[in-house]
C-alpha cells in the first residue's frame, strides 16, 4: 500500500501555519469559458493568463477575452486587457512566448471577416506593454521564433504564403508562395516544402524541400519528390517517394541538406508513416509503422550518422499518423525511455530501456505490491505505465508520466500492477532511480508536480467533486502531509508550476459555481517556509546511477561511462534553491562489444554480441549510399554506439571491407539540386 498521509513518518513541523501565511487566492472577474496560462521567461515570476468566453449566436459567435498578468509567480494578478484594446484573442494560436529570457510575447487577435489581414499584439518587455500591429496576411499558424534570434519570426498564411519578419513582427515580407510546412533550423536557417500544382494535399509525395539561410534573399532546392520532412538534433530527415511505386523512404542529412544518404530503414507504403520519437545530437529513435491498420510498428535506433539503424523494439504501440504513442523520454536519468507495446493478445504492456534503446524490459513489480484482479498469476506481473494512449482512451488518468532533468532519478506515473495496462483505476507510482525500482506513492489517480528540483512533490486527487486539499511530500514521495488550502472547495481544473521544476510556488486552478454564475479562481501556495533553510553539503548523499549489481566491476556503466550524483538525502528538509545545479561525476568504463552497434551490412545473430557479415542478400545490392562520399564506404563491421564514451577494453578490429560495389540508391543526386535567388 501507499505510504500513509500525516503519519509520523515524515512530518514537517507547523506546516499548516507556514502554508496558510503563504497561500494567495485570486478570483477572476470573468464568466467561465476557457483559460490558458503562459510563463514569460525563466525565474521572472511573470505569468500571463488569457480567459476566453464564446457564445455561439445564430449568425456569428460572440467572443470576449481578458488578459491578466502576474509578476510574483501567480500570487497576484492585474487585469491588463486594456493593453490589448479589449481585443478578442484567438486561443487556437495560444500565446507565442519568445525563447529563453527574451521577454517577448505575441498574441494573435480575432479580426472581422472582411479585413485584409490579421492583427497581432507584441510585447518585448515581459508583457508590461503591447504594440498593436496589423498584418498583411491572415495567419494559419502561430508565429514561430527563430531559436537563435527572437527578433526573427516566421508564419504561414491561410493562402500558403511563407512570411518572415526581421524586427519582431513590426514589418512582414512574403518570401515564398505555395508553402506547406516551414521550420526553423539552426543558424536562422528556414526549411520548407512547396507544391507546384494544386495544393499541399494533392502534391503530397511530389513536394520540393527548400532551404534559405538568409531569411529569403536566396534559396536552394535540397530535395524533390518529398512527402514530408523533420528536424531532430543535428539531423534533417526527409521522406521521399520511390521512383517505381508508391512507397517512400527516409533520407538523412547532417549538413543542412547539402548531401543526403538513404537511411537503412524499411520503406513504407501510402497508409504507413515514419515518426521521429526522440532525437539529440548523437542519435535518433525512429518509429516505422507496420503495413495495415495494426496500430503498431518498430522502433529503430540510429548510428551517429543517422544512416545505419538497429532494430530496437517490435510491436511498438503507435495508433495512427499523429496519433497516440506512449514513448516517453525519462529526462531525470540518461539513457532511459519508457513506451508501450501491443502484445499478440492485443493487451498493452509497458517496456523500459536504460541504455538508449539497446535492450527493453518490463518494469519491475513495485515492492510490497500485489498484482491486480486482472492478472493471471497473483505473484508474477509487472508495473504498466499509463501515458498518452491511456489518456486518449479516456481512462481515469489525469496526467502523463513526469520527470525533470534537475530532479535526478525521479519518475512519477500512473500505473497498473498487472499483466498489462489495466482498465482498473490506477494508482500513482514513483521511482527514485530512473525507473529501475518503483513504489506506490499515492492511492488512486492524482495530478502531481515537482518543485525545488525534487525537494518537494505536490499532488492533488483527481475527483469529479470539488476539492480543497493539496498533498505534499519532502522526501521524494515516501511520506505525505495534507493541507486544506481553502474552506470553500473548488472544481479543480489544473496544477501550474513554473517549467523547469525550480520554483517553490504552485498554483491550483479551478472554478467556483454558484446558482447563477461560475468564476475562475486560483490559489498560489509558496512552500518557501516549509523548506526554511538552504541545503548544505551535509544534506546531500552520493548515488551511483544505473547501479544493478555492486559485485560487477562495471556496475553503473551505461554507454561507456558511469555517473555518480550528489542527491538530496531523503530526510533533509531544505531548499535546493533556484540556482541549484546537479553535481555529477562521470568515470569512463572499459569497452565491451555491448558498446558497439553493427555497421552497415552486418548484424547480430540472436544471443550473440559479435557482428557478422550479412549474407549477400540473395544477389541484391545493398540499398545504401553516401552521396559524394564514396571513399567513406568502408567498415570493419562495428561502430561505436552514439554517445558512448568507453575506452580501452575490447577493441573489435577486423579486416576493413569496401562497400562501394554494394552501393545503390535512388534519391536525388547533387546534379538534381539547384540554387535560386529572389
Amino acid at each position: 500500500s501507499a505510504p500513509g498521509e500525516d503519519e509520523e513518518c515524515g512530518r514537517v513541523r507547523d506546516f499548516v501555519a507556514k502554508l496558510a501565511n503563504n497561500t494567495h487566492q485570486h478570483v477572476f472577474d470573468d464568466l467561465r469559458g476557457s483559460v490558458s496560462l503562459s510563463w514569460v521567461g525563466d525565474s521572472t515570476g511573470v505569468i500571463l493568463v488569457l480567459t476566453t468566453f464564446h457564445v455561439p449566436l445564430v449568425i456569428m459567435t460572440f467572443g470576449q477575452s481578458k488578459l491578466y498578468r502576474s509578476e510574483d509567480y501567480g500570487k497576484n494578478f492585474k487585469d491588463i486587457t486594456d493593453l490589448i484594446n479589449n481585443t478578442f484573442i484567438r486561443t487556437e494560436f495560444g500565446m507565442a512566448i519568445g525563447p529563453e529570457n527574451s521577454g517577448k510575447v505575441v498574441l494573435t487577435a480575432e479580426v472581422s471577416g472582411g479585413s485584409r489581414g490579421g492583427r497581432i499584439f507584441r510585447s518585448s518587455d515581459f508583457a508590461k506593454n503591447f504594440v498593436q500591429t496589423d498584418l498583411p496576411f491572415h495567419p494559419l499558424t502561430q508565429m514561430m521564433y527563430s531559436p537563435q534570434n527572437s527578433d526573427y519570426l516566421l508564419a504561414l498564411s491561410t493562402e500558403n504564403g511563407l512570411w518572415v519578419s526581421k524586427n519582431f513582427g513590426g514589418k512582414w515580407e512574403e518570401i515564398h508562395k505555395a508553402v506547406c510546412l516551414a521550420k526553423w533550423g539552426s543558424d536562422n536557417t528556414i526549411f520548407f516544402t512547396t507544391y507546384a500544382n494544386g495544393s499541399c494535399k494533392a502534391d503530397l509525395g511530389a513536394l520540393e524541400l527548400w532551404r534559405t539561410s538568409d531569411l529569403g534573399k536566396s534559396f536552394k532546392t535540397i530535395g524533390v519528390k518529398i512527402y514530408s520532412f523533420g528536424l531532430g538534433g543535428r539531423f534533417l530527415f526527409a521522406s521521399v517517394m520511390a521512383d517505381k511505386d508508391t512507397t517512400r523512404r527516409i533520407h538523412v542529412s547532417t549538413d543542412q541538406g547539402d548531401t543526403w544518404s538513404m537511411a537503412q530503414l524499411p520503406s513504407v507504403g501510402q497508409e504507413q508513416f515514419y515518426s521521429i520519437l526522440a532525437a539529440n545530437d548523437d542519435m535518433v529513435f525512429m518509429h516505422v509503422d507496420e503495413p495495415g491498420d495494426t496500430g503498431f510498428g518498430t522502433i529503430f535506433t540510429s548510428d551517429d550518422r543517422g544512416i545505419v539503424y538497429s532494430k530496437s523494439l517490435d510491436r511498438h504501440l503507435y495508433t495512427t499518423t499523429g496519433g497516440e504513442t506512449d514513448f516517453t523520454n525519462v529526462t531525470s536519468l540518461r539513457g532511459v525511455y519508457i513506451t508501450s507495446v501491443l502484445s499478440e493478445d492485443n493487451s498493452i504492456q509497458t517496456m523500459i530501456t536504460f541504455d538508449q534503446g539497446g535492450r527493453w524490459t518490463h518494469l519491475r513489480k513495485p515492492e510490497n505490491s500485489e498484482c491486480d484482479a486482472t492478472a493471471k498469476n497473483k505473484n508474477e506481473c509487472s508495473l504498466h505505465i499509463h501515458a498518452s494512449y491511456s489518456i486518449s482512451q479516456k481512462l481515469n488518468v489525469p496526467m502523463a508520466p513526469l520527470s525533470e532533468p534537475n530532479a535526478v532519478g525521479i519518475v512519477i506515473a500512473h500505473g497498473s500492477v498487472a499483466d498489462a495496462i489495466s482498465v482498473m483505476v490506477p494508482d500513482v507510482y514513483i521511482s527514485d532511480d530512473g525507473g529501475y525500482s518503483w513504489t506506490k506513492m499515492l492511492e488512486g489517480p492524482h495530478y502531481y508536480t515537482i518543485l525545488d528540483s525534487g525537494g518537494i512533490i505536490v499532488a492533488i486527487e483527481h475527483s469529479s467533486r470539488p476539492i480543497n486539499v493539496i498533498k505534499f511530500s519532502t522526501d521524494e514521495g515516501q511520506c505525505w502531509q495534507t493541507y486544506t488550502f481553502t474552506r470553500d472547495p473548488i472544481y479543480f481544473t489544473g496544477l501550474a508550476s513554473e517549467p523547469g521544476a525550480r520554483s517553490m510556488n504552485i498554483s491550483i486552478w479551478g472554478f467556483t459555481e454558484s446558482f447563477l454564475t461560475s468564476q475562475w479562481v486560483s490559489y498560489t501556495i509558496d512552500f518557501k517556509d516549509i523548506l526554511e533553510r538552504n541545503c548544505e553539503e551535509k544534506d546531500y548523499t552520493i548515488w551511483l546511477a544505473h547501479s544493478t549489481d555492486p559485485e560487477d566491476y562495471e556496475d553503473g556503466c551505461i554507454l561507456g561511462y558511469k555517473e555518480q550524483f550528489l542527491r538530496l538525502r531523503k530526510s533533509s528538509v531544505c531548499q535546493n534553491g533556484r540556482d541549484y545545479v546537479v553535481t555529477k561525476q562521470p568515470s569512463i568504463c572499459l569497452c565491451s562489444l555491448e558498446d558497439f552497434l553493427c555497421d552497415f551490412g552486418y548484424y547480430r545473430p540472436e544471443n550473440d554480441s559479435k557482428c557478422v557479415e550479412q549474407p549477400e542478400l540473395k544477389g541484391h545490392d545493398l540499398e545504401f549510399c553516401l552521396y559524394g562520399r564514396e571513399e567513406h564506404l568502408t567498415t570493419n563491421g562495428y561502430r561505436k554506439i552514439p554517445g558512448d564514451k568507453c575506452q580501452g577494453g575490447v577493441n573489435p578490429v577486423r579486416e576493413v571491407k569496401d562497400l562501394k560495389k554494394k552501393c545503390t540508391s535512388n534519391f536525388l543526386s547533387p546534379e538534381k539540386q539547384n540554387s535560386k535567388s529572389n
Epitope: R11, D433, P550, E551, D552, Y553, R569, K570, S571
Partner: antibody, heavy 124, light 106 residues
Framework: QVQLVQSGAEVKKPGSSVKVSCKAS????????ISWVRQAPGQGLEWMGG????????NYAQKFQGRVTITADESTSTAYMELSSLRSEDTAVYYC?????????????????WGQGTTVTVSS | DIQMTQSPSTLSASVGDRVTITCRAS??????LAWYQQKPGKAPKLLIY???SLESGVPSRFSGSGSGTEFTLTISSLQPDDFATYYC????????FGGGTKVEIK
C-alpha cells in the same frame, strides 16, 4: 568472501598523527563505500566518515571535520584513515567497514563487512 | 546531525524471552535504519538494514520494524548466543549510532 584486513595497533603521542589502513580482498572494492567507525574503551560506536573509491568522494562527521582524512587507492584495494592532532580521548579501536549496497545509494543499507579493528593508544 | 536515542540502555532477560529494543530518531529518517550486534572484543555484525530487512545469514528470530522516527528491534525468543550489545544506526547521509543496549542474563 569479502574480507577487510586492517593494519596493526599503534601507540602515538598527543599532537601527532596516525594513519590506519584497510585492505579489501575477495570483492569489488571500487563499488562500495568504506566507512570508518571508532569505539573508545567501554563506549559506543562513533562514525568518523566514509569514502567511495570511484572518484574518491569522501565525507566526514562534523566532529572530525578538518582533523580526519580518508583516502582510497583503487589499485591496491586499500582505504586509509588519517587522524591528526591526536589527544588522549582519541584512544579507541578504529574499525573500517564496507557499506552494504542494494541500489545506487552507498550509505543507506548498513555496514555488512567489518575489519578486525585497529587499537590506537594516545599517551604521552 | 540526527540524534539517535536507544532504550533501554541495559536489559536483563532469560533464554526464550521475547526482547524488544527501541530507537528514536530526532527527525524522520524514513526507513533508513540498521541494527547491529556486538560482542566484547569483536567487530559489530549487521542484523537488519532498511528498518526491517534481514541481512542474509541472520536468524529469523531477529526482526525490525518502524519508519519515520520510531523503530524497534525484536528478538522473538532469546538464545544464549544473543547476549550482547545492540546498536541502531541511521543511514541517511551523515551516519549516527544510538548509545547501545546491553542485553544481559537475568
Amino acid at each position: 568472501q569479502v574480507q577487510l584486513v586492517q593494519s596493526g595497533a599503534e601507540v602515538k603521542k598527543p599532537g601527532s598523527s596516525v594513519k590506519v589502513s584497510c585492505k579489501a580482498s575477495g570483492g569489488t572494492f571500487r563499488n562500495y563505500a568504506i566507512s570508518w567507525v571508532r569505539q573508545a574503551p567501554g563506549q559506543g560506536l562513533e562514525w568518523m566518515g566514509g569514502i567511495i573509491p570511484i572518484g574518491g568522494w569522501a565525507n566526514y562527521a562534523q566532529k572530525f571535520q578538518g582533523r580526519v582524512t580518508i583516502t582510497a587507492d583503487e589499485s591496491t584495494s586499500t582505504a586509509y584513515m588519517e587522524l591528526s592532532s591526536l589527544r588522549s580521548e582519541d584512544t579507541a579501536v578504529y574499525y573500517c567497514a564496507r557499506q552494504g549496497r542494494k541500489t545506487g545509494y552507498y550509505y543507506y543499507y548498513g555496514m555488512d563487512v567489518w575489519g578486525q579493528g585497529t587499537t590506537v593508544t594516545v599517551s604521552s | 546531525d540526527i540524534q539517535m536515542t536507544q532504550s533501554p540502555s541495559t536489559l536483563s532477560a532469560s533464554v526464550g524471552d521475547r526482547v524488544t529494543i527501541t530507537c528514536r530518531a530526532s527527525q524522520s529518517i524514513s526507513s533508513w535504519l540498521a541494527w547491529y550486534q556486538q560482542k566484547p572484543g569483536k567487530a559489530p555484525k549487521l542484523l537488519i538494514y532498511k528498518a526491517s530487512s534481514l541481512e542474509s545469514g541472520v536468524p529469523s528470530r531477529f526482526s525490525g520494524s518502524g519508519s519515520g522516527t520510531e523503530f524497534t528491534l525484536t528478538i522473538s525468543s532469546l538464545q544464549p548466543d544473543d547476549f550482547a550489545t545492540y546498536y541502531c544506526q541511521q543511514a541517511d547521509g551523515h551516519i549516527t549510532f544510538g548509545g547501545g543496549t546491553k542485553v544481559e542474563i537475568k
